[in-house]
Interface confidence: low
Amino acid sequence: LQDPCSNCPAGTFCDNNRNQICSPCPPNSFSSAGGQRTCDICRQCKGVFRTRKECSSTSNAECDCTPGFHCLGAGCSMCEQDCKQGQELTKEGCKDCSFGTFNDEEHGVCRPWTDCSLDGKSVLVNGTKERDVVCGPSPADLSPGASSVTPPAPAREPGHSPQ
Protein backbone atom coordinates (compact mmCIF):
# COMPACT_ATOMS: atom_id res chain seq x y z
CA LEU A 1 0.00 0.00 0.00
CA GLN A 2 1.48 3.37 -1.01
CA ASP A 3 2.11 5.87 1.77
CA PRO A 4 -0.16 8.84 1.01
CA CYS A 5 2.48 11.13 2.43
CA SER A 6 4.85 10.29 -0.41
CA ASN A 7 2.73 12.51 -2.65
CA CYS A 8 3.46 15.62 -0.58
CA PRO A 9 6.00 17.73 -2.47
CA ALA A 10 8.84 19.84 -1.08
CA GLY A 11 7.43 22.93 0.59
CA THR A 12 4.64 20.97 2.23
CA PHE A 13 4.24 18.46 5.03
CA CYS A 14 1.94 15.49 5.51
CA ASP A 15 -0.52 16.73 8.12
CA ASN A 16 -1.63 13.83 10.33
CA ASN A 17 -4.15 16.10 12.02
CA ARG A 18 -5.94 16.63 8.72
CA ASN A 19 -6.18 13.10 7.31
CA GLN A 20 -2.67 13.29 5.88
CA ILE A 21 -3.47 16.21 3.61
CA CYS A 22 -0.41 17.96 2.22
CA SER A 23 -0.30 21.30 4.04
CA PRO A 24 2.05 24.15 3.14
CA CYS A 25 4.94 24.72 5.49
CA PRO A 26 4.12 27.47 8.02
CA PRO A 27 6.03 30.75 7.91
CA ASN A 28 9.71 30.44 8.87
CA SER A 29 9.81 26.74 8.10
CA PHE A 30 10.69 24.60 5.09
CA SER A 31 10.80 21.09 3.70
CA SER A 32 13.48 20.45 1.11
CA ALA A 33 12.24 16.99 0.12
CA GLY A 34 8.85 15.44 -0.52
CA GLY A 35 7.04 13.11 1.84
CA GLN A 36 8.02 14.90 5.05
CA ARG A 37 5.71 14.71 8.08
CA THR A 38 7.00 17.97 9.52
CA CYS A 39 8.65 21.11 8.23
CA ASP A 40 12.00 22.17 9.63
CA ILE A 41 12.42 25.53 11.34
CA CYS A 42 14.39 27.98 9.22
CA ARG A 43 17.83 28.94 10.41
CA GLN A 44 17.89 32.47 11.78
CA CYS A 45 20.98 34.51 10.99
CA LYS A 46 21.26 36.42 14.25
CA GLY A 47 24.02 38.06 16.17
CA VAL A 48 27.29 37.94 14.30
CA PHE A 49 25.60 36.07 11.45
CA ARG A 50 23.79 37.87 8.64
CA THR A 51 21.45 36.48 6.04
CA ARG A 52 23.05 35.52 2.74
CA LYS A 53 19.95 33.80 1.39
CA GLU A 54 16.47 34.04 2.85
CA CYS A 55 14.58 30.91 3.85
CA SER A 56 11.93 29.67 1.44
CA SER A 57 9.31 26.97 1.82
CA THR A 58 11.70 24.51 0.12
CA SER A 59 15.16 25.61 1.31
CA ASN A 60 16.79 26.72 4.52
CA ALA A 61 18.27 30.16 5.05
CA GLU A 62 22.01 30.54 4.50
CA CYS A 63 24.13 32.75 6.70
CA ASP A 64 27.47 34.42 6.35
CA CYS A 65 29.29 36.74 8.73
CA THR A 66 29.00 40.45 9.22
CA PRO A 67 31.93 42.58 7.98
CA GLY A 68 35.00 42.10 10.13
CA PHE A 69 34.27 38.40 10.58
CA HIS A 70 34.67 35.27 8.46
CA CYS A 71 32.90 31.93 8.34
CA LEU A 72 34.18 28.76 9.97
CA GLY A 73 32.72 25.28 9.85
CA ALA A 74 30.29 23.57 7.51
CA GLY A 75 27.55 25.90 6.33
CA CYS A 76 29.15 28.80 8.19
CA SER A 77 28.32 27.35 11.59
CA MET A 78 30.60 29.86 13.33
CA CYS A 79 31.92 33.36 12.74
CA GLU A 80 35.41 34.35 13.79
CA GLN A 81 36.73 37.89 14.02
CA ASP A 82 39.05 39.06 11.25
CA CYS A 83 42.42 40.45 12.16
CA LYS A 84 44.80 42.51 10.05
CA GLN A 85 47.66 40.97 8.12
CA GLY A 86 50.53 40.49 10.54
CA GLN A 87 48.16 39.48 13.35
CA GLU A 88 46.36 36.42 14.68
CA LEU A 89 43.24 36.04 16.79
CA THR A 90 43.75 35.11 20.44
CA LYS A 91 41.28 34.95 23.32
CA GLU A 92 41.98 38.58 24.09
CA GLY A 93 41.66 39.84 20.53
CA CYS A 94 43.98 40.46 17.60
CA LYS A 95 47.66 40.24 18.51
CA ASP A 96 50.71 40.98 16.34
CA CYS A 97 52.66 38.00 15.08
CA SER A 98 55.68 37.33 17.25
CA PHE A 99 59.16 37.74 15.79
CA GLY A 100 59.96 35.00 13.32
CA THR A 101 56.35 34.44 12.30
CA PHE A 102 53.99 36.00 9.77
CA ASN A 103 50.39 36.00 8.60
CA ASP A 104 49.53 37.34 5.15
CA GLU A 105 45.78 36.87 5.57
CA GLU A 106 43.03 38.51 7.62
CA HIS A 107 42.33 35.21 9.37
CA GLY A 108 44.30 32.17 10.38
CA VAL A 109 47.37 31.95 12.56
CA CYS A 110 50.88 33.30 12.41
CA ARG A 111 53.21 30.83 10.69
CA PRO A 112 56.98 30.55 11.03
CA TRP A 113 59.15 32.14 8.40
CA THR A 114 60.65 29.69 5.96
CA ASP A 115 64.12 28.49 6.93
CA CYS A 116 65.94 29.03 3.65
CA SER A 117 68.98 27.12 4.90
CA LEU A 118 67.01 23.86 4.91
CA ASP A 119 67.08 24.01 1.12
CA GLY A 120 70.65 25.22 1.02
CA LYS A 121 69.50 28.71 0.10
CA SER A 122 70.03 32.14 1.58
CA VAL A 123 67.58 34.86 2.63
CA LEU A 124 67.08 37.26 -0.25
CA VAL A 125 64.36 39.38 1.41
CA ASN A 126 63.86 39.47 5.14
CA GLY A 127 60.56 38.32 6.60
CA THR A 128 58.09 40.65 8.31
CA LYS A 129 54.95 40.15 10.39
CA GLU A 130 52.96 40.24 7.14
CA ARG A 131 55.27 38.44 4.73
CA ASP A 132 57.42 35.35 4.64
CA VAL A 133 61.10 35.56 3.84
CA VAL A 134 62.08 35.26 0.19
CA CYS A 135 64.76 32.66 -0.41
CA GLY A 136 67.39 33.21 -3.03
CA PRO A 137 70.22 31.12 -4.37
CA SER A 138 72.83 29.87 -1.96
CA PRO A 139 76.01 31.93 -1.78
CA ALA A 140 77.81 29.24 -3.76
CA ASP A 141 75.30 29.66 -6.59
CA LEU A 142 75.93 33.36 -6.94
CA SER A 143 78.25 33.02 -9.92
CA PRO A 144 77.96 35.50 -12.82
CA GLY A 145 74.73 34.96 -14.71
CA ALA A 146 72.97 33.13 -11.87
CA SER A 147 69.88 35.06 -10.80
CA SER A 148 67.25 32.50 -9.93
CA VAL A 149 64.87 33.29 -7.08
CA THR A 150 62.66 30.51 -5.78
CA PRO A 151 59.52 31.03 -3.75
CA PRO A 152 59.85 29.57 -0.27
CA ALA A 153 58.46 26.14 0.39
CA PRO A 154 56.29 25.72 3.49
CA ALA A 155 58.52 25.06 6.46
CA ARG A 156 58.17 24.85 10.21
CA GLU A 157 61.28 26.68 11.27
CA PRO A 158 61.59 30.47 11.32
CA GLY A 159 64.04 32.27 9.08
CA HIS A 160 67.22 33.39 10.72
CA SER A 161 67.48 36.94 9.45
CA PRO A 162 66.51 40.00 11.51
CA GLN A 163 63.20 41.69 10.82
Partner: antibody, heavy 114, light 110 residues
Protein backbone atom coordinates in the same frame (compact mmCIF):
# COMPACT_ATOMS: atom_id res chain seq x y z
CA UNK B 1 44.04 53.12 25.03
CA UNK B 2 41.25 55.36 26.25
CA UNK B 3 37.85 56.88 25.54
CA UNK B 4 36.61 60.31 26.63
CA UNK B 5 33.05 61.58 26.21
CA UNK B 6 32.22 65.29 26.00
CA UNK B 7 29.27 67.53 25.21
CA UNK B 8 26.97 66.67 28.10
CA UNK B 9 25.16 69.64 29.65
CA UNK B 10 21.85 70.93 30.93
CA UNK B 11 19.34 71.45 28.11
CA UNK B 12 15.63 72.18 27.86
CA UNK B 13 13.21 69.65 26.38
CA UNK B 14 13.23 69.56 22.59
CA UNK B 15 16.76 70.88 22.31
CA UNK B 16 19.09 68.83 20.06
CA UNK B 17 22.46 67.83 21.47
CA UNK B 18 25.53 66.11 20.09
CA UNK B 19 27.92 64.11 22.29
CA UNK B 20 31.44 63.25 21.18
CA UNK B 21 33.59 60.29 22.13
CA UNK B 22 37.27 60.87 21.48
CA UNK B 23 39.41 57.76 21.17
CA UNK B 24 43.13 57.42 21.60
CA UNK B 25 45.57 54.55 21.36
CA UNK B 26 43.64 52.50 18.80
CA UNK B 27 41.98 52.82 15.41
CA UNK B 28 38.25 53.03 14.84
CA UNK B 29 38.87 50.97 11.71
CA UNK B 30 39.55 47.99 13.97
CA UNK B 31 36.72 48.16 16.50
CA UNK B 32 32.98 48.46 16.81
CA UNK B 33 31.86 51.33 19.02
CA UNK B 34 28.68 51.68 21.07
CA UNK B 35 26.81 54.31 22.99
CA UNK B 36 25.20 53.25 26.27
CA UNK B 37 23.28 55.40 28.72
CA UNK B 38 22.38 55.17 32.39
CA UNK B 39 19.62 57.20 33.99
CA UNK B 40 20.29 58.27 37.61
CA UNK B 41 19.96 55.27 39.89
CA UNK B 42 19.00 53.00 36.99
CA UNK B 43 20.63 50.30 34.88
CA UNK B 44 22.59 50.35 31.64
CA UNK B 45 20.70 50.86 28.37
CA UNK B 46 22.23 50.25 24.94
CA UNK B 47 21.61 52.92 22.29
CA UNK B 48 23.48 51.73 19.22
CA UNK B 49 26.60 50.45 17.45
CA UNK B 50 28.75 51.70 14.60
CA UNK B 51 30.82 48.89 13.09
CA UNK B 52 34.25 48.93 11.49
CA UNK B 53 32.71 49.58 8.08
CA UNK B 54 30.56 52.44 9.32
CA UNK B 55 27.31 50.45 9.34
CA UNK B 56 24.85 51.44 12.05
CA UNK B 57 22.67 49.39 14.40
CA UNK B 58 20.25 50.92 16.88
CA UNK B 59 18.06 49.78 19.73
CA UNK B 60 14.46 49.76 18.53
CA UNK B 61 13.51 52.57 20.90
CA UNK B 62 16.40 54.76 19.71
CA UNK B 63 15.75 54.64 15.97
CA UNK B 64 14.89 58.04 14.54
CA UNK B 65 15.91 60.18 17.51
CA UNK B 66 19.52 59.10 17.89
CA UNK B 67 22.17 59.15 15.17
CA UNK B 68 25.70 57.76 15.50
CA UNK B 69 28.51 58.90 13.21
CA UNK B 70 32.28 58.90 13.30
CA UNK B 71 35.45 60.55 12.07
CA UNK B 72 38.92 59.05 12.19
CA UNK B 73 39.24 59.66 15.94
CA UNK B 74 35.77 60.44 17.25
CA UNK B 75 32.36 58.83 17.52
CA UNK B 76 29.40 61.21 17.78
CA UNK B 77 25.91 60.70 19.16
CA UNK B 78 23.38 63.21 17.84
CA UNK B 79 20.17 63.39 19.89
CA UNK B 80 16.99 65.18 18.88
CA UNK B 81 13.63 65.86 20.55
CA UNK B 82 15.11 65.35 23.99
CA UNK B 83 12.74 64.78 26.89
CA UNK B 84 13.27 64.57 30.64
CA UNK B 85 13.38 60.78 30.20
CA UNK B 86 16.68 61.21 28.36
CA UNK B 87 18.42 62.57 31.46
CA UNK B 88 21.31 60.17 31.97
CA UNK B 89 25.03 59.62 31.94
CA UNK B 90 26.04 58.68 28.39
CA UNK B 91 28.96 56.29 27.93
CA UNK B 92 30.80 55.33 24.80
CA UNK B 93 32.22 51.82 24.81
CA UNK B 94 34.55 49.86 22.58
CA UNK B 95 33.60 46.37 21.64
CA UNK B 96 31.60 44.25 19.35
CA UNK B 97 30.67 40.73 18.62
CA UNK B 98 33.47 38.71 20.17
CA UNK B 99 34.55 40.11 23.52
CA UNK B 100 31.78 42.35 24.77
CA UNK B 101 32.54 45.96 25.67
CA UNK B 102 36.13 45.90 26.86
CA UNK B 103 36.83 49.63 27.17
CA UNK B 104 34.50 52.36 28.49
CA UNK B 105 34.73 56.10 28.79
CA UNK B 106 34.00 57.82 32.13
CA UNK B 107 30.68 59.10 30.82
CA UNK B 108 29.16 62.53 30.27
CA UNK B 109 26.01 63.74 32.04
CA UNK B 110 23.07 65.04 30.04
CA UNK B 111 20.32 66.73 32.05
CA UNK B 112 17.05 67.58 30.31
CA UNK B 113 14.94 69.93 32.39
CA UNK B 114 12.64 72.86 31.86
CA UNK C 1 14.12 42.77 21.21
CA UNK C 2 15.74 40.25 23.49
CA UNK C 3 15.13 40.62 27.24
CA UNK C 4 17.73 39.78 29.89
CA UNK C 5 16.23 39.02 33.31
CA UNK C 6 18.72 39.24 36.16
CA UNK C 7 18.14 37.86 39.66
CA UNK C 8 18.31 38.68 42.47
CA UNK C 9 18.00 42.48 42.38
CA UNK C 10 20.08 42.70 45.55
CA UNK C 11 22.10 40.30 47.66
CA UNK C 12 24.02 40.70 50.91
CA UNK C 13 26.80 38.36 52.03
CA UNK C 14 29.65 38.57 54.55
CA UNK C 15 33.30 38.91 53.68
CA UNK C 16 34.58 35.49 52.62
CA UNK C 17 31.17 34.37 51.45
CA UNK C 18 29.96 33.39 47.99
CA UNK C 19 27.42 35.12 45.76
CA UNK C 20 25.75 33.76 42.63
CA UNK C 21 23.91 36.05 40.23
CA UNK C 22 21.65 34.59 37.56
CA UNK C 23 20.76 35.93 34.15
CA UNK C 24 18.06 34.51 31.91
CA UNK C 25 17.73 35.46 28.24
CA UNK C 26 14.34 35.47 26.55
CA UNK C 27 15.87 33.26 23.84
CA UNK C 28 19.06 31.38 23.08
CA UNK C 29 21.99 33.83 22.95
CA UNK C 30 24.69 31.28 22.13
CA UNK C 31 27.04 32.36 24.94
CA UNK C 32 27.40 35.93 23.60
CA UNK C 33 27.23 37.08 27.20
CA UNK C 34 29.42 39.42 29.23
CA UNK C 35 29.36 40.42 32.88
CA UNK C 36 30.31 43.87 34.17
CA UNK C 37 31.01 45.37 37.56
CA UNK C 38 30.05 48.97 38.24
CA UNK C 39 30.73 50.96 41.36
CA UNK C 40 28.86 54.21 42.14
CA UNK C 41 30.06 57.11 40.02
CA UNK C 42 32.33 54.88 37.95
CA UNK C 43 32.25 53.37 34.48
CA UNK C 44 31.43 49.67 34.07
CA UNK C 45 34.33 47.22 34.07
CA UNK C 46 34.21 44.04 31.99
CA UNK C 47 34.75 40.88 34.05
CA UNK C 48 33.64 38.05 31.78
CA UNK C 49 33.01 37.60 28.06
CA UNK C 50 31.88 34.62 26.01
CA UNK C 51 29.77 33.52 29.02
CA UNK C 52 32.75 32.09 30.91
CA UNK C 53 36.06 33.63 29.79
CA UNK C 54 37.74 35.77 32.42
CA UNK C 55 38.92 39.18 31.17
CA UNK C 56 42.57 39.96 31.75
CA UNK C 57 43.39 41.32 35.19
CA UNK C 58 40.21 39.99 36.79
CA UNK C 59 40.75 37.82 39.91
CA UNK C 60 39.94 34.13 39.59
CA UNK C 61 37.46 34.55 42.46
CA UNK C 62 35.11 35.61 39.67
CA UNK C 63 33.77 32.77 37.56
CA UNK C 64 30.85 32.35 35.22
CA UNK C 65 29.04 29.65 33.31
CA UNK C 66 25.99 29.01 31.22
CA UNK C 67 24.66 28.36 27.76
CA UNK C 68 21.48 28.78 25.78
CA UNK C 69 19.25 31.02 27.87
CA UNK C 70 20.63 30.46 31.39
CA UNK C 71 23.82 32.09 32.70
CA UNK C 72 25.37 32.72 36.11
CA UNK C 73 28.17 34.74 37.68
CA UNK C 74 29.73 33.49 40.91
CA UNK C 75 31.92 35.58 43.22
CA UNK C 76 33.67 33.48 45.82
CA UNK C 77 35.75 34.51 48.81
CA UNK C 78 34.00 37.88 48.83
CA UNK C 79 36.02 40.99 49.59
CA UNK C 80 34.72 44.41 50.58
CA UNK C 81 35.99 45.73 47.24
CA UNK C 82 33.46 43.49 45.48
CA UNK C 83 30.58 45.66 46.70
CA UNK C 84 29.11 46.96 43.44
CA UNK C 85 26.31 46.49 40.94
CA UNK C 86 26.78 43.67 38.43
CA UNK C 87 25.21 43.54 34.98
CA UNK C 88 24.85 40.77 32.44
CA UNK C 89 24.98 41.82 28.80
CA UNK C 90 24.01 40.15 25.54
CA UNK C 91 26.35 41.82 23.08
CA UNK C 92 26.14 40.08 19.70
CA UNK C 93 23.59 41.73 17.49
CA UNK C 94 23.24 42.79 13.91
CA UNK C 95 19.51 43.14 13.64
CA UNK C 96 16.51 41.47 15.16
CA UNK C 97 17.46 40.73 18.74
CA UNK C 98 19.09 43.98 19.79
CA UNK C 99 21.83 44.31 22.39
CA UNK C 100 20.48 44.11 25.94
CA UNK C 101 21.67 44.49 29.52
CA UNK C 102 20.19 42.81 32.54
CA UNK C 103 18.60 45.02 35.16
CA UNK C 104 21.58 44.73 37.51
CA UNK C 105 22.28 43.07 40.84
CA UNK C 106 23.51 45.06 43.81
CA UNK C 107 26.03 43.11 45.87
CA UNK C 108 26.42 44.28 49.47
CA UNK C 109 29.38 42.89 51.40
CA UNK C 110 28.81 42.84 55.16
Amino acid sequence: QSLEESGGRLVTPGTPLTLTCTVSGFSLNDYWMSWVRQAPGKGLEWIGYIDVGGSLYYASWAKGRFTISRTSTTVDLKMTSLTTEDTATYFCARGGLTYGFDLWGPGTLVTVSS
Amino acid sequence: DIVMTQTPASVSEPVGGTVTINCQASEDISSYLAWYQQKPGQRPKRLIYGASDLASGVPSRFSASGSGTEYALTISDLESADAATYYCHYYATISGLGVAFGGGTEVVVK
